[in-house]
Amino acid sequence: NFMYSKTVKRLSKLREYQQYHPSLTCVMEGKDIEDWSCCPTPWTSFQSSCYFISTGMQSWTKSQKNCSVMGADLVVINTREEQDFIIQNLKRNSSYFLGLSDPGGRRHWQWVDQTPYNENVTFWHSGEPNNLDERCAIINFRSSEEWGWNDIHCHVPQKSICKMKKIYI
């Protein structure tokens, strides 16, 4: 019957994700019992995405690799609301890699998922970015300006934030 085949589909989808994420936390989307959205446990969710704060200190390249192994990317921040959600889970005395880099040192910033870089939706600290040698972006806290972005050397180990699309089952 219909409910049985839906359950089978769900189970096979869950098996797909099990290699990365042994446990998912799912919530019912809206009123329809058939639509569930899930994030890996203990990732947090906001709108249509899941977020994970990685506290291991790694270079930007290794951080991105670490996210991709989990089926995610370093975080791409698209709105002020999204950044406001993310910072609730960050520590003020730490810095976290974003999925934003300037690979050629030409001030041509680009997001890991090819989202177009829009100067009008950026949250750089004042006077940042400011160095051709600093090709990767972090988010950190400055007492004068609260949370914002800064450019730093990509090889200097930092914590990081991973982001993935919610899993719909």
Partner: antibody
């Protein structure tokens, strides 16, 4: 203290090439890109380009593409700039300068005079 | 490319004078404006970066100001050792470009 020591003056014939060097000391060489700037006799300063001492990639001023090649030897903390197919217009003092925060060249070498003459 | 213009190519002043050198960019450079001093022997030193920040070791008689396209360097109490040519440079956009220079002489 930060020092950039450039190689000595060169006199070269038209059509030839010349390679000038810039040795950095007093800081971590690979943390700072190296810029090259030229000054023709009685003229102002002109930015030639910049090379990353960490990655080894370069950004050139379009005007100098094909004329200039920048390289780096990390083991000796030295940046090089080779000028090819020299003409009298290339007679100038060439400076290396360290990259700094706020898109600036914070320390400069003493300059290398290249004279192109037959 | 962004054009940088220093309208005054040479300037004569007396010791102790307050001297201002100006620089104009062909478009907004977001305060990424730096000032360099070139001594007669060819030595080049950074004085001011990001419009108004004093580089380490530079005497406090040097100051910078400006925004958008118009910037200036001020030497508040002219000293004999300030005899030099002063260049502005924009770092907002590659290729970086310099003004033509202002040569400062003593009256």
């Amino acid at each position: 203290q930060v020092q950039l020591q450039q190689s000595g003056a060169e006199v070269v014939k038209p059509g030839a090439s010349v390679k000038i060097s810039c040795k950095g000391s007093g800081y971590t060489f690979t943390d700072y890109s190296m810029h090259w700037v030229r000054q023709a006799p009685g003229q102002g300063l002109e930015w030639i380009g910049v090379i990353s001492t960490y990655y080894g990639d370069s950004n050139y001023n379009q005007k100098f593409k094909g004329k200039v090649t920048m390289t780096v030897d990390k083991s000796s903390s030295t940046a090089y700039m080779e000028l090819s197919r020299l003409t009298s217009d290339d007679t100038a003092v060439y400076y290396c300068a360290r990259n700094g925060n706020f898109y600036v060249m914070d320390y400069w070498g003493q300059g290398t005079l290249v004279t192109v003459s037959s | 490319d962004i054009q940088m213009t220093q309208t005054t190519s040479s300037l004569s002043a007396s010791l102790g004078d307050r001297v201002t050198i100006s620089c104009r960019a062909s478009q907004d450079i977001s305060n990424y404006l730096n000032w360099y001093q070139q001594k007669p022997d060819g030595t080049v030193k950074l004085l001011i970066y990001y419009t108004s920040r004093l580089h380490s070791g530079v005497p406090s008689r040097f100051s910078g100001s400006g925004s958008g396209t118009d910037y200036s360097l001020t030497i508040s109490n002219l000293d004999q050792e300030d005899i030099a040519t002063y260049f502005c440079q924009q770092g907002n956009t590659l290729p970086w470009t310099f003004g033509g220079g202002t040569k400062l002489e003593i009256k």
